[in-house]
């Protein structure tokens, strides 16, 4: 799996999970989230060569097409596979609210 | 939806469905598929600016992050959303076989 266990310990040009810490205020301009101040969002990036973690028959075919026709612009792309939620604390007026935001943290990647 | 109805009638630099006909023999070097000789595989490509067809909270956050931090390398990518199967005819020896290959045709795209 193209997850932290694999990607963070290998130098990897190909599609892999990349670390990304997002500070809500600095990076997004968001003041409304009280806690946490930021979080490890991570992201997916890297090349998708022939059969590299292809997730569908189309992406496998496309990776072969791209190998045989390297001048073509059609190739699979590295995107998130497994995501996890993030629990946040914010206020409506003086009333604290706890909310779980779904699909906020990328845990693994794929070529699609 | 970023499908043929929308994408094929609009000039679109942003993430959209792109036409791609794959000739099995010429483009993949495959002789084993007897019919069809090729098919409209299509593919997804284009930029993923702020909120352009973002499919998860993470991709929405990432598109905002990328807007505010344009020098960053972290951005969503344009990938397939809906896929359809392709029915093929091939032979094992002289015995014809009909098989439905799943996820062979891209019908729409998303920023993920």
């Amino acid at each position: 799996a193209l997850d932290a266990a694999y990607c963070f310990r290998n130098v990897q040009d190909n599609c892999c999970l990349r670390p990304l810490y997002i500070d809500f205020k600095r990076d997004l301009g968001w003041k409304w989230i009280h806690e946490p101040k930021g979080y490890n969002a991570n992201f997916c990036a890297g090349a998708c060569p022939y059969l590299w973690s292809s997730d569908t028959q189309h992406s496998r075919v496309l990776s072969l097409y791209n190998t045989i026709n390297p001048e073509a612009s059609a190739s699979p792309c590295c995107v998130s596979q497994d995501l996890e939620p993030l629990t946040i604390l914010y206020y409506i007026g003086k009333t604290p609210k706890i909310e779980q935001l779904s699909n906020m943290i990328v845990k693994s990647c794929k070529c699609s | 939806a970023l499908d043929a109805a929308y994408c094929f009638r609009n000039v679109q630099d942003n993430c959209c469905l792109r036409p791609l006909y794959i000739d099995f023999k010429r483009d993949l070097g495959w002789k084993w598929i007897h019919e069809p000789k090729g098919y409209n595989a299509n593919f997804c490509a284009g930029a993923c600016p702020y909120l352009w067809s973002s499919d998860t909270q993470h991709s929405r956050v990432l598109s905002l992050y990328n807007t505010i931090n344009p020098e960053a390398s972290a951005s969503p990518c344009c990938v397939s959303q809906d896929l359809e199967p392709l029915t093929i005819l091939y032979y094992i020896g002289k015995t014809p076989k009909i098989e439905q290959l799943s996820n062979m045709i891209v019908k729409s795209c998303k920023c993920s």
């Epitope: 059969l51 496998r60 072969l64 045989i68 | 070097g29 495959w30 002789k31 084993w32 091939y90």
Partner: nanobody, 114 residues
Framework: QLQLVESGGGLVQPGESLRLSCAAS????????MAWFRQAPGKQRELVAL???????NYADSVKGRFTISRDNAENTVYLQMTELKFEDTAVYYC????????WGQGTQVTVSS
Amino acid sequence: QLQLVESGGGLVQPGESLRLSCAASGIIFSASTMAWFRQAPGKQRELVALITDGDRTNYADSVKGRFTISRDNAENTVYLQMTELKFEDTAVYYCNAFWLKAYWGQGTQVTVSS
């Protein structure tokens, strides 16, 4: 039961040759796109060469002119002839078959050392 079994790896000196073989069973070999990949310690897996069922071939830039991939459909075997071997060719070499799904062998070690 699908099986891809590699053989032919070993220890050679720079400039020497090796021939890797991969015997396949449990797949429709003649329809499969066959490939050799390699992975050196601490490096990512990379495509070395592939050959389609229509005998279309493709090689990594680093091995062009030195390596040749071929297949024998009667024997269900794919070969990788490696010549003018270099230190940087040292890796575990994996056989791959792609027909409807992707299948992998267990790998064979190639070490180029003086």
